[in-house]
Interface confidence: low
Amino acid sequence: EPPTACREKQYLINSQCCSLCQPGQKLVSDCTEFTETECLPCGESEFLDTWNRETHCHQHKYCDPNLGLRVQQKGTSETDTICTCEEGWHCTSEACESCVLHRSCSPGFGVKQIATGVSDTICEPCPVGFFSNVSSAFEKCHPWTSCETKDLVVQQAGTNKTDVVCGPQDRLR
């Protein structure tokens, strides 16, 4: 009686279980009663990453420099090319199909987490006692200068965008 289900790495065709092609190879012809499944390696810019019965391999992803992309990992016959973004840019999606410039944190905000090739800069408002006076994708909030440790006094209070201004003690008359 012909099978209704096949083992792992096999497929059912014409009431017969045929071997799937291994990753990196495509199907040329199904097996018959007398012959094994015929498979062929994928071409040099192609891949298949699973046991399969595909008659065409997939083209490797193209990391388009016009979109700010570069190759992070070259593709093989069994794996797709992995793209990443040029330094200073990050992917717009998990598939990394294009890149955008890392966001900068405005004055009054500091970098909580530096951007990576796949995630944007995360900014946070500078809390009391801290400031940031630049627009930057790297700078954290800096603590206000401690005037006391320099034997100075606060002459101008700090804000989230400016440091305190320290000055000498008023001279005793």
């Epitope: 420099p65 016009n66 570069r70 190759v71």
Partner: antibody, heavy 124, light 112 residues
Framework: QVQLVQSGAEVKKPGASVKVSCKAS????????MHWVRQAPGQGLEWMGW????????NYAQKFQGRVTMTRDTSISTAYMELSRLRSDDTAVYYC?????????????????WGKGTTVTVSS | DVVMTQSPLSLPVTPGESATISCRSS???????????LDWYLLKPGQSPQLLIY???NRASGVPDRFSGSGSGTDFTLKISRVEAEDVGLYYC?????????FGQGTKLEIK
């Protein structure tokens, strides 16, 4: 046809900087990385680094890090290589070379078009 | 950095004979996709370098079939069958597996 036209010969004093230009024509400038390779007298070829003309991203050989700056002006399809703090051993012919970027074969990149070279002489 | 070593450094050849240049790398240039990331370039006197062979054995567009590349891993060969006078110049192998790209010292081919 595809060509890279480089700026003329330069004579510089030690400690000075030189900026060599490489004007591309016959293809989409932003679609191909640009490399810089040099050849000192009696020496072999030496890779200096590349720039992605699209994003401005760069990759410099460690040896030149801090002394070399690669830039581009996409409006005139021109790449630049500036080398600072010149020494006598920087005397060389400097070539720009387009790197073929494509899906075939297997994302392999190779330098298929070269400029004619710019001679830079460093002498006191 | 990957170190590339060429031999011989000088190669006098009679026109019509064949010439063989060897190139050895300090680490394997065979990538997991089955390709060897090695190119051959020719620098003719007064000209700029020209690509001859890429991926170890693929002839570049417009290069005569007298030029052939072979080898895998760390050992590579460039063969020129029936050398012609116009083949004189410096031949360089270059690894493109990782940056910095590195070249061999060059082999000077001259006509006897």
């Amino acid at each position: 046809q595809v060509q890279l036209v480089q700026s003329g010969a330069e004579v510089k004093k030690p400690g000075a900087s030189v900026k060599v230009s490489c004007k591309a024509s016959g293809y989409t400038f932003t679609g191909y990385y640009m490399h810089w390779v040099r050849q000192a007298p009696g020496q072999g070829l030496e890779w200096m680094g590349w720039i992605n003309p699209n994003s401005g991203g760069t990759n410099y050989a460690q040896k030149f890090q801090g002394r070399v700056t690669m830039t581009r002006d996409t409006s005139i399809s021109t790449a630049y290589m500036e080398l600072s703090r010149l020494r006598s051993d920087d005397t060389a012919v400097y070539y720009c070379a387009r790197e073929r970027v494509g899906a075939t074969p297997t994302y392999y990149y190779y330098m298929d078009v070269w400029g004619k070279g710019t001679t830079v002489t460093v002498s006191s | 950095d990957v170190v590339m070593t060429q031999s011989p450094l000088s190669l006098p050849v009679t026109p019509g004979e064949s010439a063989t240049i060897s190139c050895r790398s300090s680490q394997s240039l065979l990538y997991s996709n089955g390709y060897n990331y090695l190119d051959w370039y020719l620098l003719k006197p007064g000209q700029s370098p020209q690509l001859l062979i890429y991926l170890g054995s693929n002839r570049a567009s417009g290069v005569p079939d007298r030029f052939s590349g072979s080898g895998s891993g760390t050992d590579f060969t460039l063969k020129i069958s029936r050398v012609e006078a116009e083949d004189v110049g410096l031949y360089y192998c270059m690894q493109g597996l990782e940056t910095p790209y590195t070249f061999g010292q060059g082999t000077k081919l001259e006509i006897k």
